[in-house]
């Protein structure tokens, strides 16, 4: 019988996002079927018109895949028989952002979920002293970020105090002139406490911690997704 | 450590009944399907039957088909294969296997004997 | 249904040799064929799965080669722990067939 007399399979996505220039993941995962023969996976891009991705068979079926994504998706062939349909697609592009759709056909019949993908650029930020300022002073710099993010300083000693009076930021855009380097200074740092410089976007959330004391500098770093249901 | 752990052979008249069980541990047992596989003594191996994570998908071999059941409860982490009808030539030692891409963990083995 | 015909059915070699141990199914099952080593006694160990991707903790002599309806395992330097039968199994779709084996003997 035809898939119209078939049973709704369930499928599920996550929300995610994908850094500018690296290799990002789509993820999607269904009830898998024991074996790969009936197994159809296709990945489609709302307003584009080929698909992203099509696997059946066993193995990747690309001829109706849209000029925007050749040569740059994969499924994780080996996994697709347990159940994962993830997309791997590298070399993210700004324009890769939007809404997708994940399409899972099996023997006891199909299903989908659409997953919102956002782009942009985010990294790691890392904190130093400069000792080539005049006063105490820290340097918190991160190489990649898109949008353009917030920075605030934060303190474990004064705990909600307000840093932008003694602190300042700048934003210098890299060579592919989409992405930017941030760079913050904080001033009038004082010893024995832990400083914060916190770069946010509205995908990205990274944190730089340093913890300075007369003995010993401990850094910190910590960078999160955001609206991603992981 | 990931471990399956197959219970219930032994020896039984033809046309008898036999359910056999497989106890997971180690793993996240919902989340995997799980696969019946048989050795005759002295031969080689054979599929039996399969089962989807959630049992949305169950498959037998035709040499089994209408004569063995194959179930799962997920929430005792535990894999059954119910034999109806046996025959002589279901002698073998039957494994549990976990399904992946390919039979990724496997049980120690069951040994069904069906003779008169 | 899918047969998958394995050869040789038995071979003979000695510790240090290079292994090639071929499977033939009768259609094409992509890459979805795993390798198994089972010893006497044993439950049979996978080897190799997606035809080419080595399992966690299998040695690197171990390899796996083929996709359509042609496969190897190789072993590049025979052990004497490698001494054993050795299966391929398809499960591109049921059903699930595995080879007739090929049981590897000390020379």
């Known amino acids: 019988f035809g898939i119209s007399g078939r049973h709704s399979i369930t499928v599920t996505t996550v929300a995610s996002a994908g850094n500018i220039g690296e290799d990002g993941i789509l993820s999607c995962t269904f009830e898998p079927d024991i074996k790969l023969s009936d197994i159809v996976i296709q990945w489609l891009k709302e307003g584009v018109l080929g698909l992203v991705h099509e696997f059946k068979e066993g193995k990747d079926e690309l001829s109706e895949q849209d000029e925007m994504f050749r040569g740059r998706t994969a499924v994780f062939a080996d996994q697709v028989i347990v159940g994962n349909a993830s997309l791997r697609l590298k070399n993210v592009q700004l324009t890769d952002a939007g809404t997708y759709k994940c399409y899972i056909i099996t023997s006891k019949g199909k299903g989908n979920a659409n997953l919102e993908y956002k782009t942009g650029a985010f990294s790691m930020p890392e904190v130093n002293v400069d000792y080539n300022a005049s006063s105490e002073t820290l340097r918190c710099e991160a190489p990649r970020w898109f949008p353009q993010p917030t920075v605030v300083w934060a303190s474990q000693v004064d705990q909600g105090a307000n840093f932008s009076e003694v602190s300042n930021t700048s934003f210098e855009l890299n060579s592919e002139n989409v992405t930017m380097k941030v760079v913050s200074v904080l001033y009038n740092v004082t010893i024995n406490n832990t400083y914060s410089c916190m770069i946010e976007n509205d995908i990205a959330k990274a944190t730089g911690d340093i913890k300075v004391t007369e003995s010993e500098i401990k850094r910190r770093s910590h960078l999160q997704l955001l609206n991603s249901k992981a | 450590e990931v471990q399956l752990l197959e219970s219930g052979g032994g020896l039984v008249q033809p046309g008898g009944s036999l359910r056999l069980s497989c106890a997971a541990s180690?793993?996240?047992?919902?989340?995997?399907?799980m696969h019946w596989v048989r050795q005759a003594p002295g031969k080689g191996l054979e599929w039996v039957a399969s089962i989807s994570s959630s049992s949305g998908y169950i498959y037998y071999a035709d040499s089994v088909k209408g004569r063995f059941t194959i179930s799962r409860d997920n929430s005792k982490n535990t894999l059954y294969l119910q034999m109806n009808s046996l025959r002589a030539e279901d002698t073998a030692v039957y494994y549990c296997?976990?399904?992946?891409?390919?039979?990724?963990?496997w049980g120690q083995g069951t040994t069904v004997t069906v003779s008169s | 249904d899918i047969q998958m015909t394995q050869s040789p059915s038995s071979l003979s070699a000695s510790v240090g040799d290079r292994v090639t141990i071929t499977c033939r199914a009768s259609q094409s099952v992509s890459s979805a064929v795993a390798w198994y080593q089972q010893k006497p006694g044993k439950a049979p160990k996978l080897l190799i799965y997606a035809a080419s991707i080595r399992e966690s903790g299998v040695p690197s002599r171990f390899s796996g080669s083929g996709s359509g309806t042609d496969f190897t395992l190789t072993i590049s330097s025979l052990q004497p722990e490698d001494f054993a039968t050795y299966y391929c199994q398809q499960y591109y779709s049921t059903p699930l067939t595995f080879g007739q084996g090929t049981k590897l003997e000390i020379k």
């Open positions: 180690g793993f996240t047992f919902s989340s995997y399907g």
């Open positions: 296997a976990r399904a992946s891409s390919g039979m990724d963990v």
